[in-house]
């Protein structure tokens, strides 16, 4: 038995910021679970981990450096992804373990969404002209 | 409270297998890795692998990944390393130890250590 | 494999000394690494866990630091009881690896 996954299949981070929402056919109150996010299409990089259980307060960390947050929904956790760069854009992938109660439950593979990571332009500013030859 | 009790000494002869146990009680035992590691006499420590009981997914250190083998009964909250192919340079204290599953950086809690000797 | 550089690999100091370990990684392992105790013919203790956190019941006169590469166990004042040798662990990726070992003995 397997829980299903949405994404949206593509995001833009303008801003060098993203949040990514990961949608599941599964209530995750009152479960002890493990959701994470995955870079690349062999899901090589974990870029980041929302650690829930009934009994503590959410835990959320990335051990690849990525600046990630998260927050929880009855059934979804949505991952907000800060300071990225332009080389980080990829396809990335929501995954959801499910520890306890028994038997241990995750998903089946989503189809991922693409993030497009759009570089900052930096245009001159028409009020610090450069200086101009006589 | 919370213990890994493992198996007792072994003596086995070059060539052989040995099968440590390691029983698990006063925790969840599939919120939790069981990681096993050995330290060879007067050494340090050696990560040999690890399992998650939910799933039965394994990690194996390369150097060992051909002759160790891990698993677990959930039933019994016992896991089970297998080291086969014994050489005198396997003579060690054996050690289960866990990490958190959804928090997996450290081993908080460790076996009493079991003794291999293998000797002809 | 990530390499854990311990030094020294021993030394000898006195109660109610300041003792200083450091651990450097091959590679950058941001704050996730820890730190045991082990004492002969037992099993390691967890002191430190991603790198400054003190684990329940740890004394606190253990204190670690370091973010990256490099790494600090600090003894504030050195008691009887924590003549052992002390190991540094990275958690980041697999396979885990553990640093060769501090000896701390009475001097």
């Known amino acids: 038995n397997k829980i299903l996954v949405k994404q949206s299949p593509m995001l833009v981070a303008y801003d060098n910021a993203v949040n990514l929402s990961c949608k599941y056919s599964y209530n995750l109150f009152s479960r002890e679970f493990r959701a994470s996010l995955h870079k690349g299409l062999d899901s090589a990089v974990e870029v980041c981990v929302v650690y829930g259980n009934y009994s503590q307060q959410l835990q959320v960390y990335s051990k690849t450096g990525f600046n990630c947050d998260g927050k929880l929904g009855n059934e979804s956790v949505t991952f907000y992804l800060q300071n990225l760069y332009v080389n980080q854009t990829d396809i990335y992938f929501c995954k959801i373990e499910v520890m306890y109660p028994p038997p241990y439950l995750d998903n089946e593979k989503s189809n991922g969404t693409i993030i497009h990571v759009k570089g900052k332009h930096l245009c001159p500013s028409p009020l610090f002209p450069g200086p101009s030859k006589p | 409270q919370v213990q890994l009790v493992q198996s007792g000494a072994e003596v086995k002869k070059p060539g052989a297998s040995v099968k440590v146990s390691c029983k698990a009680s006063?925790?969840?035992?599939?919120?939790?890795?069981i990681h096993w590691v050995r330290q060879c006499p007067g050494q340090g420590l050696e990560w040999i692998g690890c399992?998650?009981?939910?799933?039965?997914?394994?990690n194996y250190n390369e150097k060992f990944k051909d002759r160790a083998t891990l698993t677990v009964d959930t039933s019994i909250s016992t896991a089970y390393m297998e080291l086969s192919r014994l050489r005198s340079d396997d003579t060690a204290v054996y050690f289960c130890t866990r990490s958190h599953y959804g928090l997996d950086w450290n081993f908080d809690v460790w076996g009493q250590g079991t003794t291999v000797t293998v000797s002809s | 494999d990530i390499q854990m550089t311990q030094s020294p690999s021993s030394l000898s100091a006195s109660v109610g000394d300041r003792v200083t370990i450091t651990c450097h990684a091959s590679q950058n392992i941001y704050v996730w690494l820890n730190w045991y105790q082990q004492k002969p013919g037992k099993a390691p203790k967890l002191l430190i866990y991603k790198a400054s956190n003190l684990h329940t019941g740890v004394p606190s006169r253990f204190s670690g630091s370091g973010s990256g590469t490099d790494f600090t166990l600090t003894i504030s004042s050195l008691q009887p009881e924590d003549f052992a040798t002390y190991y540094c662990?990275?958690?980041?990726?697999?396979?885990?690896?553990f640093g060769g070992g501090t000896k701390v003995e009475i001097k």
């Open positions: 399992i998650y009981p939910g799933n039965v997914n394994t």
């Open positions: 662990q990275q958690g980041q990726t697999y396979p885990y690896t």
């Open positions: 006063g925790y969840t035992f599939t919120s939790y890795y």
